[in-house]
């Protein structure tokens, strides 16, 4: 808002741009015939200091020279970096009511001379790109500073370009717009950056480079893969590259992997054969390029090619298990179960399974295909049967897995001994056993089978199983193991043509049951009372029930109740007691016990025995 200095002038010594820490003298002079009317001697010149348009100081006390009514000189010190505005005003002291009138103003810039630019780095992206150089300018100068980038090279040529830094923009990179072509591969270039401002100048050290040092090839493009004869393990990776590329780096990995396979290819000319791919696997491929075998820089990685390798026929063998159930005197139901192949064995989408049941002597064969992982058939109880299953994808089928159908628990001498089940943590159970004592034939393998002891589990849910080599006597089961659920666990010992088994119940974690059994009836037969109950609902059992307790006491008695403990059997739902007095009314109830403790009591029932007491 200074009115173009009509009243006078302001000058700065030594200059309006000064180094940090320097002092300056600001002189304010009135033009002839300007000033306070009537009393020139009453002219008072004052100097005001503004930073960011805010008045910060009246420099009245900093006068070092005064021509009364005509000019004044002020010394300013301790100026901070950047720009400071000084405004000279005329104060007519005989008129207190009028504010001081602006005379003129000046801006003083405080800064530092530029440091020599450092760490110059030049890059040309691609054979057709242009040279761009960047550098570190050093400390901020707080002044407008001009930078000149100068590139000298062959053909007696020098290229230069300028930019500047100030408080609004920073200059530490310039694109010269010129392309270095491969015919200059042997040539040397020298680059330097010069910085200059009002307080001085400085130059970087010269930095020398060659074409190969600075040209970074563009990443390869148009990547594709061709699978030879639709092979799932062999493919030719193809891509487009800049003409001068002599070295490529390939990296590839299955999509769910965390480590890359790396390959270096010299003079690949946009083609490379890969031989170790996994069939039917989603892969990611990327390629990088270099213009020189020893020097130069790698390009950025190309965009990823994501593709799935073709299928190949399944390998590996299916893990088969079965259940036998007699239907009547001459028929049995065979249910076959098998586990899906893992992806590296399936090597494609399994379309179906080929299942065969064969009676060995009569050569009867039942064949079928199914998409499921189980198959049930009714067959005669006579004869020796064998089953086989193979998995098929679009390229072929796996080798069939054979299993002899034997009576799984038919040979007591093959039953494993001392079977135990211990909870290891929330989701697994350690099963241990001892080998059969007097087996007629050698144990070929053990099968540990388990299923949740819940209503309908045999029909609704397939079993889970683990195959264990004959010299192992333990298994950690974890598949589909949940806490607070009781599992029936069977350990089968299988020989060539026989089977023996032992059974145990186990859980991975247990709590006391939520409730006790519900007494449904009390009946008296032959001087004994029979207590009947319904089992605790499955979700409320909270683990394996070890035993039930029946409690009774006389109706109004305060004495401790008597109790009878019954080993838990799922098939049992009544039990006799015989120590009650006739014609005395009793209250009875039941509880259930797991390894974690006893449930609350179930419902109470009153009963008065009529018969003769023992």
């Amino acid at each position: 808002n200074i009115d173009v200095c009509k009243l006078g002038t302001v000058t700065v010594q030594p200059a309006p741009v000064i180094p940090l820490g320097s002092a300056a003298n600001i002189s304010c002079s009135l033009n002839p015939k300007q000033g306070c009317s009537h009393y020139p001697s009453s002219n008072e010149l004052i100097l005001l200091k503004f930073v960011n348009d805010v008045l910060v100081e009246n420099l009245h006390g900093k006068k070092v020279h005064d021509h009364t009514g005509h000019s004044s000189t002020f010394q300013v010190t301790n100026l901070s970096l950047g720009m400071t505005l000084f405004v000279c005003k005329l104060n007519c002291s005989n008129s207190q009511k009028k504010p001081p009138v602006p005379v003129c103003g000046v801006e003083i810039s405080v800064g530092v001379a530029p440091e020599p630019p450092q760490n110059i780095s030049c890059v040309q992206e691609g054979e057709n790109g242009t040279v761009a150089c960047s550098w570190n300018s050093g400390k901020v100068t707080y002044l407008k500073t001009n930078y000149t980038l100068q590139l000298s090279g062959p053909n007696n040529l020098t290229c230069q370009k300028q930019c500047f830094s100030d408080n609004r923009q920073n200059c530490n990179r310039l694109d010269l717009g010129i392309n270095l072509s491969p015919d200059l591969a042997e040539s040397r270039f020298i680059v330097r950056v010069t910085a200059i401002n009002d307080l001085g100048n400085s130059s970087s050290l010269p930095h020398t480079f060659t074409f190969l040092d600075i040209v970074i090839p563009l990443p390869p493009w148009d990547i594709r893969i061709n699978f030879l004869n639709a092979s799932g393990s062999r493919g030719t990776l193809q891509w487009e590259d800049e003409g001068q590329v002599v070295l490529n780096q390939l990296r590839y990995q299955p999509l769910n992997s965390t480590s890359w396979n790396m390959v270096n290819a010299t003079n690949a000319k946009g083609k490379y054969d890969l031989r170790d791919l996994r069939p039917f696997t989603e892969y990611e491929f990327q390629i990088s390029s270099k213009l020189h075998l020893s020097g130069g820089s790698w390009s950025n990685w190309s965009e990823s090619l994501r593709t799935r390798t073709p299928e190949e026929e399944p390998v590996g063998i299916l893990d088969i298990w079965y259940m036998k159930q007699d239907i009547d005197y001459d028929r049995q139901q065979i249910s076959l179960f098998w586990k899906s192949l893992n992806p590296s064995e399936a090597r494609g989408k399994i379309l179906h399974y080929q299942v065969t049941l064969q009676e060995v002597t009569k050569k009867t064969t039942l064949q079928n295909t199914t998409r499921h992982t189980s198959w049930t058939r009714v067959i005669p109880r006579t004869g020796a049967w064998t089953a086989s299953v193979s998995a098929a994808n679009s390229k072929g089928a796996s080798a069939p897995t054979h299993i002899n159908i034997v009576d799984l628990c038919g040979t007591g001498l093959l039953a494993p001994h001392q079977v135990s089940a211990k909870s290891e943590n929330m989701d697994n159970i350690l099963v241990t056993w001892q080998p059969p004592k007097k087996a007629d034939s050698a144990v070929r393998e053990y099968i540990v089978e388990w299923r949740a002891l819940q209503p309908g589990s045999i029909t609704k849910f397939p079993p889970h199983w683990l195959r264990i080599p004959p010299d192992n006597m333990s298994a950690l089961i974890s598949e589909n193991i949940k806490p607070y659920i009781c599992y029936e666990i069977r350990v089968h010992a299988l020989s060539e043509s026989q089977g023996g088994c032992s059974s145990i119940r186990g859980d991975s974690k247990h709590k006391a049951p939520v409730s006790g059994p519900h007494i449904t009836a009390i009946t008296e037969k032959k001087e004994r009372l029979f207590i009947s109950w319904t089992h605790i609902p499955f979700p409320e059992q909270r683990g394996c029930i070890l035993h039930y307790r029946i409690y009774w006491k006389e109706r109004d008695s305060t004495a401790q109740p008597e109790l009878c403990e019954i080993q838990y059997r799922r098939s049992q739902n009544s039990h006799p007691i015989s120590s009650l007095q006739p014609r005395v009314t009793y209250v009875l109830w039941m509880t259930a016990v797991t390894a974690a403790g006893e449930s609350p009591q179930g419902n109470e029932r009153e009963f008065c025995p009529q018969g003769k007491a023992n």
Epitope: N128, T130, G153, P154, N155, N156, L157, C159, Q160, K161, Q162, D175, L176, G177, I178, N179, L180, S181, D183, L184
Partner: nanobody, 127 residues
Amino acid sequence: QVQLQESGGGLVQPGGSLRLSCAASGRTFSNSVMGWFRQAPGKEREFVAALMWSAGSEFYTDSVKGRFSISGDGAKNTVYLQMNSLKAEDTAVYYCAAKNPPHRWSDIGKSPHYEYWGQGTQVTVSS
């Protein structure tokens, strides 16, 4: 039709200065390089300086670096060559020339790569 018109030549004493102008017409040269070449009697045409409009980069041959300065006025489609500290060996006919992309280091200083040429202006440095 593209035309390049030089002006500003003349006789000057050694150590003196001259400013040559080259006005281009017939098309815009925003992607071009406009340069100055010179040819002394009995010698081949040689590169002096050039300006790459789009990048703002200047090019100089070693013998004039620090003495000559090239600049341009995009609004007027004109390139200037400020020549200071002139020497007798700077005497030549000065030609204005323009080239289309691509702009390669190998091409900038070579006259065959320039498609458009002016008629030339004589510069004589003599006492």
